[in-house]
């Protein structure tokens, strides 16, 4: 059977079940020190 679980970040629909956000945010980083 064929599956289509990936999605485009252009899509207004979030990922169905790929497990990844449609346009992941950059993780915030703390300054060293």
């Amino acid at each position: 059977s064929e599956t289509t679980t990936g999605t485009s970040s252009n899509s207004s629909q979030s990922t169905s079940n790929s497990g990844l956000a449609p346009n992941p945010t950059n993780a915030t980083t703390k300054a060293a020190g």
Epitope: S1, E2, T3, T4, T5, G6, T7, S8, S9, N10, S14, T15, N17, S18, G19, L20, A21, P22, P24, T25, N26, A27, T28
Partner: antibody, heavy 115, light 112 residues
Framework: EVNLEESGGGLVQPGGSRQLSCVAS????????MNWVRQSPDKGLEWVAQ??????????RYVDSVKGRFTISRDDSENTVYLQMNNLRAEDTGIYYC??????WGQGTTLTVSS | DVVMTQTPLTLSVTIGQPASISCRSS???????????LNWLLQRPGQSPKRLIY???NLDSGVPDRFIGSGSGTDFTLKISRVEAEDLGVYYC?????????FGGGTKLEIK
Amino acid sequence: EVNLEESGGGLVQPGGSRQLSCVASGLTFSKHWMNWVRQSPDKGLEWVAQIQLKSDNYAIRYVDSVKGRFTISRDDSENTVYLQMNNLRAEDTGIYYCTTGTDYWGQGTTLTVSS
Amino acid sequence: DVVMTQTPLTLSVTIGQPASISCRSSQSLLYSNGKTYLNWLLQRPGQSPKRLIYLVSNLDSGVPDRFIGSGSGTDFTLKISRVEAEDLGVYYCVQGTHFPYTFGGGTKLEIK
């Protein structure tokens, strides 16, 4: 049934190059983001690179440690994703998995970088 | 990067007994669409990882309902209501909310 089959691993000297390939079947390849994830005893599982869809202008992301050395690409007509690896380092050693997201994983291909 | 911390490192469980694995993230995994992209994987010995759960609590096709995912924000749990022999392996949490995607260090489930 979804199948992802990686190839191209092997023994490479530090500073050398290698290209990995992953052929997908059982899914509409052109509708999936494709990723490479690697696994090593030292670092565990580590996401390496991602290539998105034609509708996203094939947007690409890399983990910082491989930027400028690795290049991900895809050929939707051949249902294949590639990882070109240059200037390889000992810390690049590991099993490289092709994945669609977190859902489908290949069996992996082993890369060893050693002199 | 988002740090994913799993506990315990090793879990030794008798068949038929419950098991619980914790996963904590250094930042909230709640995405702007209201979904939380937290996944659980199982890597059996000699095999590649296989996903069990996505979006915190959704079971993948074919995964027994003895696997239960829960949590929110930064604190997540995978529970196995009754461990079976086929459950042995290493369990990983992985977040897909923030770039780069990051994995927990793994929890090895052993059968007593």
